[in-house]
């Protein structure tokens, strides 16, 4: 997956970090009190749909296949730059009965973005 | 994940069966001659507003929430309808070297769809 | 400690409006959703909707769709619930209530709610 | 929308004996599911979120289970503060949904 640098507009992996703080969650969420969650942005040509070696990948390219050959009711489906690879992370946080939760969470941080 | 019913214009996985004939595929894949891979359709409403929020990733709720703000950059950022679970499935196909494959492929049949 | 505090109670005609506030301490307003939800003197508990504090996105039942308004202000981390042209059988005890809604983390209950609102419609 | 039938709508049970109550809903709504108590002139309370965490300072007398559709509380030995009205929700969908309740009355 591309990371952007500013001079492509396909489809890439963002640098971003999340404040709790900055959402409310501060009072909740105890540990960390942030983290670089990443996101995906760009453009999904057809030619380079399910090609980014993405988990997506052998789906994406028989979706793509009907896609490219105008397909319907593929033709109208926007292929999307989205999150292919995701890495969890451990968060210590208050759970809806005020308990106190230590949990590893499941799809945190992007690592890398392909298109659907 | 909602299923498509036609009534929802809701993010929802919709049927699909892929014939590797109509593809060209059939010379090289032995066997399945098709699958049910399934797509991803529909809006993606902010969360809030969604019918469910049950498959989204804990990256999607806290990019959404910046994007309910308008926050810059994710208000121009659209929210995708996309694959959230997909399903193996084993494959015999002949590879590169004309060698015959029996092998479990990953990320073949979208289960379940949820707003990226 | 967090607490959810309703505006008194209300006499209303049929066919008027009614303005129920929530005043919410304790807690960081813009981190959780607040919800409304009704209840007919000796009957069930009906959900009205929910507001997101954070950026004031609303989801409403769809029976009352076109009649309620839910809104917030932050600087005074207060929820407000309208509900026009009112009827007889509106006559209920209204709740706040405040939740988030993070199906990653499995949280969406209610964890504290309002003492409530009766609001009695009658001519 | 899932709804959630709870049963029976009266329960009448002795002091110090077990109670049990049942909520099913019309589709999975997973563990997405809380159960409250409610007493007469007053807001509902949490007793049990997740289908079986307890929430703090509810005595470990009440208990959940069940995942997807089907849904037991259970109040092992009945006090007498807890004759009341109780209730599931679901929180995996919008719009939200509560049972009809289940009212625990003294034999």
């Known amino acids: 997956g591309l990371e952007c640098d500013g001079k492509v507009n396909i489809c890439c992996k963002k640098q971003f970090f999340v404040s709790f703080k900055d959402i409310g969650w501060n009072d909740w969420i105890i540990a960390p009190s942030g983290y670089h969650a990443n996101y995906c942005e760009g453009e999904c040509p057809s030619h380079i749909a399910g090609t980014s070696g993405s988990s997506l990948s052998f789906h994406s390219t028989v979706i793509n296949h009907y896609r490219m050959r105008g397909h319907s009711p593929f033709a109208n489906l926007k292929s999307c730059c989205v999150p292919t690879k995701l890495r969890p992370m451990s968060m210590l946080y208050y759970d809806d009965g005020q308990n106190i939760i230590k949990k590893d969470i499941q799809n945190m941080i992007v690592e890398e973005c392909g298109c659907s | 994940g909602l299923e498509c019913d036609g009534k929802v214009n809701i993010c929802c996985k919709k049927q699909f069966f892929v014939s590797f004939k109509d593809i060209g595929w059939n010379d090289w894949i032995i066997a399945p001659s098709g699958y049910h891979a399934n797509y991803c359709e529909g809006e993606c409403p902010s969360h809030i507003a969604g019918t469910s929020g049950s498959s989204l990733s804990f990256h999607s709720t806290v990019i959404n929430h910046y994007r309910m703000r308008g926050h810059s950059p994710f208000a121009n950022l659209k929210s995708c309808c996309v694959p959230t679970k997909l399903r193996p499935m084993s494959m015999l196909y002949y590879d590169d070297g004309q060698n015959i494959i029996k092998k479990d492929i990953q990320n073949m049949i979208v289960e379940e769809c949820g707003c990226s | 400690q967090v607490q959810l505090v309703q505006s008194g109670a209300e006499v209303k005609k049929p066919g008027a409006s009614v303005k129920v506030s929530c005043k919410a301490s304790?807690?960081?307003?813009?981190?959780?959703?607040i919800h409304w939800v009704r209840q007919v003197p000796g009957q069930g508990l009906e959900w009205m909707g929910v507001?997101?504090?954070?950026?004031?996105?609303?989801n409403y039942a769809q029976k009352l769709q076109g009649r309620v308004t839910m809104t917030t202000d932050t600087s005074t981390s207060t929820a407000y619930m309208e509900l026009r042209s009112l009827r007889s059988d509106d006559t209920a005890v209204y709740y706040c209530?405040?939740?988030?809604?993070?199906?990653?983390?499995?949280?969406?209950?209610?964890?504290?709610w309002g003492q409530g609102t009766l609001v009695t419609v009658s001519s | 929308e899932i709804v959630l039938t709870q049963s029976p709508a009266t329960l009448s049970v002795s002091p110090g004996e077990r109670a049990t109550l049942s909520c099913r809903a019309s589709?999975?709504?997973?563990?997405?599911l809380a159960w409250y108590q409610q007493k007469p002139g007053q807001a509902p309370r949490l007793l049990i979120y997740?289908?079986?965490d307890r929430a703090t300072g509810i005595p470990a007398r009440f208990s959940g289970s069940g995942s997807g559709t089907e849904f037991t509380l259970t109040i092992s030995s009945l006090q007498s503060e807890d004759f009341a009205v109780y209730y599931c929700?679901?929180?995996?969908?919008?719009?939200?949904?509560f049972g009809g309740g289940t009212k625990v009355e003294i034999k």
């Open positions: 507001i997101s504090a954070y950026s004031g996105d609303t």
């Open positions: 929700i679901q929180y995996s969908n919008y719009p939200r949904t």
């Open positions: 209530a405040r939740a988030r809604d993070i199906a990653a983390l499995g949280l969406g209950a209610f964890d504290y």
């Open positions: 997740g289908a079986s």
């Open positions: 589709q999975s709504v997973s563990s997405n």
């Open positions: 304790g807690y960081t307003f813009t981190g959780y959703h």
